[in-house]
Interface confidence: low
């Protein structure tokens, strides 16, 4: 209840997160024209990326473009990119939708299509659909430890969400363990009324809200966090312009003294931790 006699102050907060879990990924791997099933293990270093601010990212799906090298090649025949003669291709032109700089030549992409040749990382990335089901769908069972330190400078009061009495093997539950700061990713989605398996395909943004409503008066002291969860991105993927959440990164290597890279389009969940609240004291 609102105590009008108290001096209220907004919370100042810092957040640190640690994700844990192992995923086994099974995917089709093509080597020398032969496609076979490949198995790989993903640990924390493979699927999490450090983000600025109160956010962390967990990769749940990906599309790879392997063995790219800087050279000349036909660009991907996306809509409107096909050509029939060199006149359609402008030397030095950088189309924002393209992956390189045009050389001015119209060349064969495959048996039936021609596109403008580009100077780029080749072969250029294909516009592939994200795999369904998601390759790292087992990320649903990963856990995240959230460390949240808060401060009310005006009241000279500091505390944190992790108590000395807390059990390191607990898992947050709204009813049974509402003060545990280790969260199962699948549970976060369940609490928000979302389907993890579905969101994992294209990615998304999930908000973890930590609300501190602190009464700092010594006679009725209370200062513990309340956790709630909600999806922050546009969930109507059919209607939204760019559905889900993804970004690209590359792994570079040398082969026969030629620099090559594997381009990875990573789909996943960005978790934004939103800390708010007030501290009141007489």
């Amino acid at each position: 209840s609102d105590k009008l006699y108290q001096r209220k102050e907004p919370v100042i907060s810092s957040v640190h997160t640690k994700v844990k879990g192992i995923a086994e990924v099974t995917e089709n791997v093509t080597e020398g024209g032969v496609t076979k099933l490949g198995h790989s293990i993903f640990d924390t270093a493979d699927y999490t990326f450090p983000l600025q601010g109160n956010s962390f990212f967990v990769m749940t799906n990906y599309v790879k473009s392997e063995g790219q090298v800087q050279t000349l090649c036909p660009e991907y025949p996306r809509r409107g990119a096909q050509c029939s003669s060199d006149r359609r291709c402008k030397k030095g032109w950088m189309d924002p939708q393209s992956k390189g700089i045009q050389t001015g030549r119209c060349v064969p992409y495959d048996k039936t299509r021609k596109t403008c040749e580009v100077s780029a990382w080749c072969p250029t990335e294909e516009e592939k659909e994200a795999p369904r089901p998601a390759l790292l769908r087992s990320a649903e069972n990963f856990t995240v430890l959230i460390k949240n330190n808060i401060h009310f400078p005006g009241h000279n009061y500091t505390t944190r969400n992790i108590l000395p009495t807390m059990n390191g093997s607990c898992t947050f539950h709204k009813t049974w363990d509402p003060q545990c700061s280790i969260f199962r990713l699948g549970d976060i989605f369940q609490e928000a009324g979302e389907n993890f398996t579905e969101v994992a395909v294209q990615g998304g943004i999930m908000g973890i809200e930590i609300y501190w409503d602190c009464n700092l008066d010594s006679w009725s002291h209370h200062c513990r966090p309340r956790y709630s969860f909600r999806r922050l991105d546009d969930k109507n993927t059919d209607e939204s312009f760019v559905p889900g959440y993804n970004f690209r990164y590359a792994k570079y290597y040398k082969e026969n003294n030629v620099e090559k890279r594997t381009l990875i389009k990573a789909f996943g969940i960005r978790f934004d931790i939103l800390v708010f609240g007030t501290g009141g004291k007489f």
């Epitope: 050279t71 064969p108 048996k111």
Partner: nanobody, 126 residues
Framework: EVQLVESGGGLVQAGGSLRLSCAAS????????VGWFRQAPGKERDFVAT????????HYLDSVKGRFTISRDNALNTVHLQMHILKPEDTALYYC???????????????????WGQGTQVTVSS
């Protein structure tokens, strides 16, 4: 490896025709795309035309489209380049090349080809 030998070059007047042939030996020829390239003195080797392994598809340099025709006969292990309405700027040493790596269906770059002939000279006088 595929061995290639070109023939059919010569001196011709502008507006005339020539038919270049490329004879191959080697088992992989019939499953390899083949291309013709040309190199004028002091210039880089340029793509002219390419034909798919099965002879179904072709690709040409824009400036030779409608004048040159590439064809192949896998039974005889030969590829031909029929050239009509020749121009002085067509003067060059013409090379036949095979792409045995299978890296592209219709390769059009020098580095995509791994077997080359010695070349045959085509001179077009005005």
């Amino acid at each position: 490896e595929v061995q290639l030998v070109e023939s059919g070059g010569g001196l011709v007047q502008a507006g005339g025709s020539l038919r270049l042939s490329c004879a191959a030996s080697g088992r992989t020829f019939s499953s390899s795309p083949v291309g013709w390239f040309r190199q004028a003195p002091g210039k880089e080797r340029d793509f002219v035309a390419t034909i798919s392994w099965n002879g179904v598809d072709t690709h040409y340099l824009d400036s030779v489209k409608g004048r040159f025709t590439i064809s192949r006969d896998n039974a005889l292990n030969t590829v031909h380049l029929q050239m009509h309405i020749l121009k002085p700027e067509d003067t060059a040493l013409y090379y036949c090349a095979a792409s045995t790596s299978g890296s592209a269906y219709l390769p059009y770059r020098v580095y995509q080809y791994d077997s080359w002939g010695q070349g045959t000279q085509v001179t077009v006088s005005s």
